[in-house]
Amino acid sequence: KAMHVAQPAVVLANSRGTASFVCEYASPGKATEVRVTVLRQADSQVTEVCAATYMMGNELTFLDDSICTGTSSGNQVNLTIQGLRAMDTGLYICKVELMYPPPYYMGIGNGTQIYVIDPEPCPDSD
């Protein structure tokens, strides 16, 4: 079953290569457990950046090697992606799945274009 997911159109990563954006979904049922996946689309290829699962009202659980962190509040998930470089600039899509209880719902946002600018190296001070 389809579900509406909203996310900002554009986000600029900070100088440390960290970008944050909110992913909001319209829950049609009583969601107990939600899975959030961040997908990166570049050159017509889609790759999974990270995925988390969480029970409503609890913290997001990412896998150990994840470059993402996040918090949830109601039907909003605040996602942060770390360690980004200029080459990681691209469209980051938020996919939300209501895993539990049935029925299963899934929604995909239109994507957030994240721009990453590598910081200029500091000039030698000698």
Partner: antibody
């Protein structure tokens, strides 16, 4: 601390019904789904079904939909598993377990050993 | 239904050893894999959830890994109290299903 208390054993006759109990304490009973699991030596662990104590919504494993009925009593924070038309195949240990994130079960009862025998 | 297979039904190891228990799903379960310990008296405890997350109170010598269809539970520095049967369980799709269990014994 979280506790799920189950009777140790039940002995019943073939063809009859039995209602197994699981009394929860140490947490808000209506905030977590309760699941039931059957264990037999050869078949291993089998998921029977689950119930949301807040509104009694249930989901069953198709293999148990004509065998098991799940209910709750919110006033006593107790979950129940009723098994009908009992046969020797129903002889097993039955566990109640609280649902946690990623559909894991973070706390289990001690299990009730059900023996169906004439 | 998703079939969960633990190919090794029993495993013998010495105290202090590192032991790995494996579990395979019949289809991708997207890291919704949980591990349980069942003691001889029937007591069941959650060890690991969502592939690698250690449940509160579980010793750090237990760890989980894997993805897709293949998952692993590792126990380092094996202790006497670890003698038990270990079950995997998938939480991706109803009905939830369990592996057949791996019984861990001391050499």
């Amino acid at each position: 601390q979280v506790q799920l208390q189950q009777p140790g054993a039940e002995l019943v006759r073939p063809g009859s019904s039995v209602k197994l109990s699981c009394k929860a304490s140490g947490y808000t009973f209506t905030s977590y789904w309760m699941h039931w699991v059957k264990q037999r030596p050869i078949q291993g662990l089998e998921w029977i079904g689950n119930i949301d104590p807040s509104d009694s919504e249930t989901h069953y494993n198709q293999n148990f939909k004509d065998k098991a009925t799940l209910t709750v009593d919110k006033s006593s924070s107790t979950a129940y598993l009723q098994l009908s038309s009992l046969t020797s195949e129903d002889s097993a240990v039955y566990y109640c377990a609280r649902r946690y994130t990623s559909s894991s079960f973070d706390y289990w009862g001690q299990g009730t050993t059900l023996t169906v025998s004439s | 239904d998703i079939q969960m297979t633990q190919t090794t039904s029993s495993l013998s190891a010495s105290l202090g050893d590192r032991v790995t228990v494996s579990c395979r799903a019949s289809q991708d379960i997207r890291n919704y894999l949980n591990w349980y310990q069942q003691k001889p008296d029937g007591t069941v405890k959650l060890l690991i959830y969502f592939t690698s997350k250690l449940h509160s109170g579980v010793p750090s010598r237990f760890s989980g890994s894997g993805s897709g269809t293949d998952y692993f539970l590792a126990i380092s520095n094996l202790e006497q109290e670890d003698i038990a049967t270990y079950f995997c369980q998938q939480g991706n799709t109803l009905p939830y299903t369990f592996g057949g269990g791996t019984k861990l014994e001391i050499k």
